[in-house]
């Protein structure tokens, strides 16, 4: 139960943790199981224990094996195993699938590849990404902390992603890769009578006669690329286009993909230097798509200035 | 609702709806029909000087709806009748959705039959 399989390639840097986690203040004693025989914590040594962590620095082939971790407080003990294969470097670009970590898979909106077990290691930036052992180029990739982002993702990005990193010890500098596949899912999009965030139904603004206002139609139409979707204002049922007041203007505001995946609209109505007039119109957020229309009326109400008198 | 009755597949019928008791400021108007033992069915709705109209897949093409503002009513055309258009044919309306799902529908009109047969 308490056993992990951890894997590596001969000559690069290999760091294992305990499969049986303890406070930092536990102590941490590591065997060669087939042995019993003690790691030593000495770091002179290319393998070493270093708390809950077992170094390989670097790892050789006959390193494989099962390695025993006890972490030990004052009143328990726990046990562990971690179950280490050191593999030889292949002559070719073939990643073997033992040589694979857990497959991720992305979507035009979420392309991240983490890059598996590096924050075992001390390592800095940048990292160094391949896909089918070629070297990512081009404006499209981006090496961030300790994932790749990919833009635009095509079914074409799948394939195995291999990060490439430095581990650094006492100055000493360890090479480290992992590779793992990365597959790309269709997102399926779907739209849904609009709903409209703001402005609230009957909504009362209040406004300064002279100065500017400006009102913003917000709405959501369902999960990815919309068709036929719009948000815009009228004025007493009339386009602003139509209404013939060149004070009033909408103008279009950002394309919105919320965290939530929701795809959203905004309009903003900018009304310069508000008139008494403006106060008897019907402000309409209007927000339609292929399954119908949605409004929210606003009105306008004149914010008295605050009489600074005392 | 006015306009209901039988007529022979292929022929054409004219349904109307008046409105009262809103000032003009932006309303939607629907067709909605119900066959027995079927449920509620959207068939055509319209926004304000119908700029925004909406027709169900079944009457595209057929169909038409239509407003006259200044005597609040909106009408439905319907050409080509089929026998699977026979049903009670409603008029609703709403002042702030609009599209075929009757759930947002306010005010309801008593309805109209259209039968036609083969």
């Known amino acids: 139960k308490f056993s992990k399989q951890s894997w590596g390639l001969e000559n690069e840097a290999l760091i294992v943790r305990c499969p049986r986690q303890g406070k930092p203040s536990y102590t941490v004693d590591w065997y060669y199981s087939q042995t019993n025989k003690s790691i030593p914590t000495q770091e002179r040594n290319r393998v070493f224990a270093s708390g809950q962590l077992l170094k390989f620095l670097p790892a050789a082939v006959a390193d494989s094996g099962i390695y025993t971790c006890i972490v030990r407080s004052p009143t328990f003990n726990r046990t562990g195993y971690a179950n280490v294969t050191i593999y030889k470097k292949q002559s070719d670009c073939n990643v073997p699938d033992y040589l694979m970590y857990s497959t991720v898979s992305g979507s035009e909106k979420n392309s991240k590849i983490y890059c598996p077990t590096i924050d075992l290691y001390n390592w800095t930036a940048p990292l160094e990404w391949f896909k089918n052992c070629q070297a990512l180029q081009g404006s499209r990739y981006r090496a961030h902390k300790s994932f790749l982002v990919i833009d635009n993702v095509m079914t074409e990005d799948a394939g195995d992603y291999t990060c490439k990193f430095i581990h650094n010890e006492n100055g000493a500098n360890y090479s480290v890769t992992a590779t793992r596949s990365f597959t790309v899912k269709d997102e399926q999009g779907f739209s849904l009578f609009p709903v409209i965030g703001a402005p609230a139904q009957n909504e009362i603004k209040e406004v300064e006669i002279g100065k500017n206002a400006n009102l913003t139609c917000s709405a959501c139409f369902g999960k990815g690329t919309q068709f036929l979707a719009a948000v815009l204002w009228q004025l007493n049922g009339t386009k602003i286009t139509d209404f013939g007041e060149p004070r009033i203007q909408q103008e279009e505001g950002q394309n919105q993909s919320f965290s939530n995946g929701l795809a959203c609209l905004d309009m903003v109505l900018r009304i310069a230097d508000v008139k008494e007039e403006d106060l008897l119109l019907q402000y309409d957020c209007l927000a339609l798509n292929l399954h119908g229309l949605r409004r929210h009326t606003v009105r306008l109400s004149r914010k008295n200035p605050i009489d600074h008198h005392s | 609702e006015s306009g209901g009755g039988s007529v022979q597949a292929g022929g054409s019928l004219r349904l109307s709806c008046a409105a009262s008791?809103?000032?003009?400021?932006?309303?939607?108007m629907g067709w909605f029909r119900q066959a027995p033992g079927k449920e509620r069915e959207g068939v055509a709705a319209?926004?304000?000087?119908?700029?925004?109209?909406y027709y169900a897949d079944s009457v595209k093409g057929r169909f038409t709806i239509s407003q006259d503002n200044a005597k609040n009513t909106v009408y439905l055309q319907m050409n080509s009748l089929k026998p699977e258009d026979t049903a009670m044919y409603y008029c609703?309306?709403?002042?702030?959705?609009?599209?075929?799902?009757?759930?947002?529908?306010?005010?309801w009109g008593q309805g109209t039959q259209v039968t036609v047969s083969s």
């Open positions: 609703a309306a709403d002042r702030n959705t609009c599209g075929l799902r009757g759930d947002f529908y306010n005010y």
């Open positions: 008791g809103y000032t003009y400021s932006g309303i939607c």
């Open positions: 319209i926004y304000t000087n119908g700029e925004y109209t």
